[in-house]
């Protein structure tokens, strides 16, 4: 149904920046406005099928929410309509447009760029750094400290409370308690254990409305096992001659891990020894002042063709060893390619 005679329509549009990342528009509407968000590709190029989401959850059309491929309308906006709206490509889930929407008490002037302090508005809570509210899953090893934060504002200043799996969460609910730092909008749990797994929701509210954010915590159990290496790391790399390259290796281990980076080499034309063990040279290993974090990265500077080949991240602890490998391909510099092309050489892929 179209907006009634008393309702003002306030439009906000963002251009889809093609292959560039989407920009988060921070916009304000007045209570009772019809919110209209538009997401248009440059030059009218088709975006393909899209879906609209609010705070990460898909929006379903209703008598009040009108969902179109490149346009979203919310009739008679209320404080509950505040949040982060995104238009995404239905198949790839690539974010095409991003809006952080606040709904204030007064009808909107239609101009959110006057540079005035936002807290002067009387209104429902809103995230003060909405772009930071998208890290929803946290996986940490047992015994680590976990901190969830939900910085928000509103007028009057909103209160913050926490739920675990939908129920009120208080210090007595866990051994070791929790630290609630209301001014920092944070919940801190020290020395987490598997029973701390679950969904943690911050609820920020004042008399004009409430917003919430849910984080999922997974606690990786400490059990005696060899190091676990993150899948997909290190990743294969292709580099131009003379450029810099980094290989990354994420290691999870309860017992103190020993990390080494190896490069596979040939000895007398053979890659493996008589016993089948590959020939390798150690490029990086623990030293007196090296941290595990530093060992998780192998940096190669000013690469040459000799640097091409197979690299292995090897991690061991008292229980055993794990390793992942990746390949480096080194391509000639562009000028070199052009010179050889002019000389009539042919390169086969």
């Amino acid at each position: 149904e179209p907006p009634g005679p008393e309702q003002r329509v306030v439009r906000r549009a963002a251009e889809v920046p093609g292959p560039e990342p989407s920009q988060q528009e921070q916009v304000a509407f007045g209570s009772g406005d019809t919110v209209e968000l538009s997401c248009h590709p440059p030059g009218g190029a088709p975006t393909g099928p899209t879906v609209w989401a609010k705070d990460g959850t898909g929006l379903v059309a209703s008598h009040r929410i009108l969902v179109g491929p490149q346009r979203l309308q919310v009739l008679n906006a209320s404080h509950e309509d505040a949040g982060v709206y995104s238009c995404q490509h239905r198949l790839t889930r690539r974010v095409l447009c991003h809006f952080s929407v606040r709904v204030t008490d007064a009808p909107s002037s239609g101009d959110d760029e006057d540079g005035e302090d936002v807290a002067e508005d009387t209104g429902a809570p809103y995230w003060t750094r909405p772009e930071r509210m998208d890290k929803k899953l946290l996986a940490v090893p047992a015994a680590n400290t976990v901190r969830f934060r939900c910085p928000a504002a509103g007028n009057p200043t909103p209160s913050i409370s926490w739920l675990k799996n939908g129920k009120e969460f208080r210090g007595e609910h866990r051994i070791g308690g929790i630290k609630l730092r209301h001014q920092q909008w944070s919940l801190v749990m020290e020395s987490v254990v598997p029973s701390d797994r679950g969904n943690y929701t911050c609820v920020v509210e004042n008399k004009f409305g409430s917003i919430r954010q849910t984080y999922t915590l997974d606690v990786l159990e400490r059990s005696p096992h060899r190091p676990i290496l993150q899948a997909g790391l290190p990743a294969n790399q292709t580099a131009i001659l003379g450029s810099d390259v980094e290989f990354h290796c994420k290691v999870y281990s309860d017992a103190q891990p020993h990390i080494q980076w190896l490069k596979h080499v040939e000895v007398n034309g053979s890659k493996v020894g008589p016993d089948g063990t590959p020939y390798v040279t150690v490029l990086k290993t623990a030293g007196a002042n090296t941290t595990d974090k530093e060992l998780e990265v192998l940096s190669l500077h000013n690469v040459t063709f000799e640097d091409a080949g197979e690299y292995t991240c090897l991690a061991g602890n008292s229980i055993g060893f794990s390793h992942h490998s990746a390949w480096l391909v080194v391509l000639p510099a562009e000028e070199e390619l052009m010179e050889t092309d002019e000389a009539g050489s042919v390169y086969a892929g």
Epitope: P21, D134, Q183, Q184
Partner: antibody, heavy 118, light 107 residues
Framework: EVQLQQSGPDLVKPGASVKISCKAS????????MNWVKQSHGKSLEWIGD????????TYNQKFKDKATLTVDKSSSTAYMELRSLTSEDSAVYYC???????????WGQGTTLTVSS | DIVMTQSHKFMSTSVGDRVSITCKAS??????VAWYQQKPGQSPQLLIY???TRHTGVPDRFTGSGSGTDYILTIRSVQAEDLALYYC?????????FGAGTKLELK
Amino acid sequence: EVQLQQSGPDLVKPGASVKISCKASGYTVTDYYMNWVKQSHGKSLEWIGDINPNNGVTTYNQKFKDKATLTVDKSSSTAYMELRSLTSEDSAVYYCAREEDFDGFDYWGQGTTLTVSS
Amino acid sequence: DIVMTQSHKFMSTSVGDRVSITCKASQDVSTGVAWYQQKPGQSPQLLIYWASTRHTGVPDRFTGSGSGTDYILTIRSVQAEDLALYYCQQHYSTPLTFGAGTKLELK
């Protein structure tokens, strides 16, 4: 060791565009947001905007919305800032700085000096 | 935008002194304040975030305090290497904003 290595100084003519790079090393680039900051000669610091390297989502200071475009190339762990329609007012030192969630800029690049002059 | 005001452009001190640099926000920033040190020709360095949390490796003579709109960076016993520019920043709400800076110099 965490390092943010920025591209070298640049002298450009008014009206032109420039692209400054910031190569991150010593950490996993997708674990931190990348911010960009302007410091005009003898002046304070101005936040230009930030980018989430995971999904490329950017947030800009309105003042720089039509001036700067932030991008990131995950494969090379490099963040970029393009500045367009340059004037003498854009002459400054530009820094990239990483931030974990909400906790301040813990590592900064060495700065890139941009001079706009005809 | 939130305006961060550092009322003293310069502060004179002697080695061994205790000095307090102040910063006032134009609205409540809920302890979302960071402090940076910048020496000539160098990039800023993070000292304190969330008003009072010391960044890794920062000497314990640097402490931060405050809430609401008023924040203080205290250097307990100034060393020669502490003579520098100090900026406050609110990292609570976008757009993030910095103070104009306070230069700490020798008397």
